[in-house]
Amino acid sequence: VGGYICEENSVPYQVSLNSGYHFCGGSLISEQWVVSAGHCYKSRIQVRLGEHNIEVLEGNEQFINAAKIIRHPKYNSRTLDNDILLIKLSSPAVINSRVSAISLPTAPPAAGTESLISGWGNTLSSGADYPDELQCLDAPVLSQAECEASYPGKITNNMFCVGFLEGGKDSCQGDAGGPVVSNGELQGIVSWGYGCAQKNRPGVYTKVYNYVDWIKDTIAANSHHHHHH
């Protein structure tokens, strides 16, 4: 909501999760792994990489089925705490200028830092208009105090807020699982909010920094290493 059409393939780590329709976003973090939101779990997912217009085959797409879908073991569907999911692709993505991985964070998100949020979610705060072309939004990371004041009792240490307290610009339904990137690092995953783009109701995002070890451990445990003796 309140964003702009991204330059084509300018967000090369952005993926679309498809189950006959686009239902969530995600981020490519290595040639065979995608991170998304825990609440985007489905038993069958096709991962679509290199997308810009999700309704048109433009020639840069890679459609790869999910081989493994691993939700965080402490995901809570009621509070959306630990709202993170890993998807192992059935075959590695071909990395090129339009499809490439985003780095995991080396430090937690800092208030005031500019970030890029992207997705194919609803662009209306009231009503429905799901775009075909990838939308981008530049938004600042808010302080934890502002975040907690916006959602008293709802914000855990695994969440942070990004956006504008005055409303008008925000992620929305259909953007879940997608990236929040600051300084070339994946800081957030689109998670939840009360409505979209409402005053004093900024978007709430999964704090990826808290899951770097879980991500690395899960990837290691689900990768086949051939040991030669």
Epitope: G20, Y21, C40, S77, G121, A128, C172, G174, A176, G177
Partner: antibody, heavy 125, light 107 residues
Framework: QVQLVQSGAEVKKPGASVKVSCKAS????????ISWVRQAPGQGLEWMGW????????NYAQKLQGRVTMTTDTSTSTAYMELRSLRSDDTAVYYC??????????????????WGQGTTVTVSS | DIQMTQSPSSVSASVGDRVTITCRAS??????LAWYQQKPGKAPKLLIY???SLQSGVPSRFSGSGSGTDFTLTISSLQPEDFATYYC?????????FGGGTKVEIK
């Protein structure tokens, strides 16, 4: 295979209550929601309400608000729909149907892909 | 509430005919529309979801199109088992609403 099996037909008197069950199998119950839809004789489909199997959040049709309660029992993968203060115009076939969850900022898509066989409820004095 | 208006309410057709049913939403619902087939005494069966995606196991003679407010279900070559009532449903927001139905009858 994925299926929803509903309880048997009921005959009730006006003013009474009815509770219809819907047992799910073949999938993870808490990954989906359940909608309830009814169809009066010779009429079209009328949505009654929706319940999240994972959070128990509900959304009811306004005309039934106060008379209907939807619940789930995750231990038995069963959804229930109770309708109180029955009237003759509640005579219908009642269906449960599987739908997607409405969680966070996931795309809201409220279609129903698997339906129960239907439960006939007759309200007559 | 979003009103769904289906037309025609009934259509008489022969085996092999192309049949088109339309559904109009009172406000924009993007692609969030489903089509169901119902035979007498049976539960509805999902045919098309998200306006144009064919449900697994449904014959390819069924297709859906549209976005926003205007949607179409097409049966490219009517088969004997297709004589039934068809309903559209907006899947965009609560309260969920259905069209009034279109009965496809044998001519």
């Amino acid at each position: 295979q994925v299926q929803l099996v509903q309880s048997g037909a009921e005959v009730k008197k006006p003013g009474a209550s009815v509770k219809v069950s819907c047992k799910a199998s073949g999938y993870t119950f808490t990954d989906y929601a359940i909608s309830w839809v009814r169809q009066a004789p010779g009429q079209g489909l009328e949505w009654m309400g929706w319940i999240s199997a994972s959070t128990a959040d509900t959304n009811y049709a306004q005309k039934l608000q106060g008379r209907v309660t939807m619940t789930t029992d995750t231990s038995t993968s069963t959804a229930y729909m109770e309708l109180r203060s029955l009237r003759s115009d509640d005579t219908a076939v009642y269906y449960c149907a599987r739908g997607t969850e409405v969680v966070g900022k996931m795309t809201v898509y409220l279609g129903m892909d698997v339906w129960g066989q239907g439960t006939t409820v007759t309200v007559s004095s | 509430d979003i009103q769904m208006t289906q037309s025609p309410s009934s259509v008489s057709a022969s085996v092999g005919d192309r049949v088109t049913i339309t559904c109009r939403a009172s406000q924009g619902i993007s692609r969030w529309l489903a089509w169901y087939q119902q035979k007498p005494g049976k539960a509805p069966k999902l045919l098309i979801y998200a306006a144009s995606s064919l449900q697994s196991g449904v014959p390819s003679r069924f297709s859906g199109s549209g976005s926003g407010t205007d949607f179409t279900l097409t049966i490219s070559s009517l088969q004997p088992e297709d004589f039934a009532t068809y309903y559209c449903q907006q899947a965009n927001s609560f309260p969920i609403t259905f069209g009034g139905g279109t009965k496809v009858e044998i001519k």
